[in-house]
C-alpha cells in the first residue's frame, strides 16, 4: 500500500496488557491503509470511556480478539 504523504496513524504506544472483555465498551480494529501502514486496535473501556491502543502481535490481545468475535457470533442470529 503506498503511503500518503501525511501519516494518519493514531497509536504512539501500544499495550500488551490483557483486557477483560467485560470491561470493554468498544473495540476498533483499523486495518492498514494508504494513510497508516499498520493495523491499529483501539479499546474503549467502560470506565470513564478511557481509550487504549493494544498490541496486535500480543498473545493476550489475540486471545481478546478471539473472545470478542466468539461473543459477537453468539449474539448474531
Amino acid at each position: 500500500v503506498p503511503l500518503s504523504r501525511t501519516v494518519r496513524c493514531t497509536c504512539i504506544s501500544i499495550s500488551n496488557q490483557p483486557v477483560n472483555p467485560r470491561s470493554l465498551e468498544k473495540l476498533e480494529i483499523i486495518p492498514a491503509s494508504q494513510f497508516c501502514p499498520r493495523v491499529e486496535i483501539i479499546a474503549t473501556m467502560k470506565k470513564k470511556g478511557e481509550k487504549r491502543c493494544l498490541n496486535p502481535e500480543s498473545k493476550a490481545i489475540k486471545n481478546l480478539l478471539k473472545a470478542v468475535s466468539k461473543e459477537r457470533s453468539k449474539r448474531s442470529p
Partner: antibody
Framework: QVQLVDSGGGVVQPGRSLRLSCAAS????????MHWVRQAPGKGLEWVAV????????HYADSVKGRFTITRDNSKNMVHLQMNSLRAEDTAVYYC?????????????WGQGTLVTVSS | EIVLTQSPATLSLSPGERATLSCRAS??????VAWYQQKPGQAPRLLIY???NRATGIPARFSGSGSGTDFTLTISSLEPEDFAIYYC??????????FGQGTKVEIK
C-alpha cells in the same frame, strides 16, 4: 527497573549540528513511544518531539520543525535526536522521556538529561 | 495551542504546612492533566496523572483534583524533600504537549 540514559550534549557553534542519544533498558522498548523534552537554563519545560513505538509517527514542536529529526533503533533500544541549524535559543538540557502508554500523552520516566550549549 | 498558567509563581512555606498549587488551562482539557516535581539538577518526576491519580511510588500526602480548566495539586503536610519546582502538563491526544511555567515551593 526502567532506565533512560541521555548522551551526546556539548558546546556547538550556531548553525552547526549535534546528535543526541538515549539508551533505554528495563522495559519492552518496542511498545513505547519516546519523547524529547528540553529545559533552557533557569526556565520551564518544553516538549520537543515524539516518535511512536514503531517509528511511523513523528511530531515536532513548531520551534524545531524542519531542523530536528527524531529516530529510533528498536534493535538497540535507542532513540536519537538529530539537531541541525542550531540556534542560541536551542541551548538547554535535553531529556529523553518515555510515553505513558495510555491514550493521552504524559511522561512516566525521564533520562538524566544532557546539556546542549549553542554559542559562538 | 493550550496554554497552562500556574499560580503562585513561588510559595514560601514551612515543613508540616499544607501547600496548594494551581494550574489553569486556556481551554478545557477534561481531566487530562499531569503534575511533575523537579529538584535542582534532577530530571522531572511524574507525581499525578489524569488530574487525581498518583503515579507509582508517590506518597499519599500528594493529591490532585480538578477538571475542565482548573486544577489543583495539594501537598497535605510538607516534608523537607518536597521543596522543589512543580509543573503541570496538559495531556491532550495531539501535540504540542504543553507545560505550565512552574511553581517553586521554597522553605520559609
Amino acid at each position: 527497573q526502567v532506565q533512560l540514559v541521555d548522551s551526546g550534549g556539548g558546546v556547538v557553534q550556531p548553525g552547526r549540528s549535534l546528535r543526541l542519544s538515549c539508551a533505554a533498558s528495563g522495559f519492552t522498548f518496542n511498545t513505547y513511544g519516546m519523547h524529547w523534552v528540553r529545559q533552557a537554563p533557569g526556565k520551564g519545560l518544553e516538549w520537543v518531539a515524539v516518535i511512536s513505538y514503531d517509528g511511523i509517527i513523528k511530531h515536532y514542536a513548531d520551534s524545531v520543525k524542519g531542523r530536528f529529526t527524531i529516530t529510533r533503533d528498536n534493535s538497540k533500544n535507542m532513540v536519537h535526536l538529530q539537531m541541525n541549524s542550531l540556534r542560541a535559543e536551542d541551548t538547554a538540557v535535553y531529556y529523553c522521556a518515555r510515553d505513558s502508554s495510555s491514550w493521552y500523552v504524559y511522561f512516566d520516566y525521564w533520562g538524566q538529561g544532557t546539556l546542549v550549549t549553542v554559542s559562538s | 495551542e493550550i496554554v497552562l498558567t500556574q499560580s503562585p509563581a513561588t510559595l514560601s512555606l514551612s515543613p508540616g504546612e499544607r501547600a496548594t498549587l494551581s494550574c489553569r488551562a486556556s481551554q478545557s482539557v477534561s481531566s487530562y492533566v499531569a503534575w511533575y516535581q523537579q529538584k535542582p539538577g534532577q530530571a522531572p518526576r511524574l507525581l499525578i496523572y489524569d488530574a487525581s491519580n498518583r503515579a507509582t511510588g508517590i506518597p499519599a500526602r500528594f493529591s490532585g483534583s480538578g477538571s475542565g480548566t482548573d486544577f489543583t495539586l495539594t501537598i497535605s503536610s510538607l516534608e523537607p524533600e518536597d521543596f522543589a519546582i512543580y509543573y503541570c502538563q496538559q495531556r491532550s491526544n495531539s501535540p504540542p504537549w504543553t507545560f505550565g511555567q512552574g511553581t517553586k515551593v521554597e522553605i520559609k
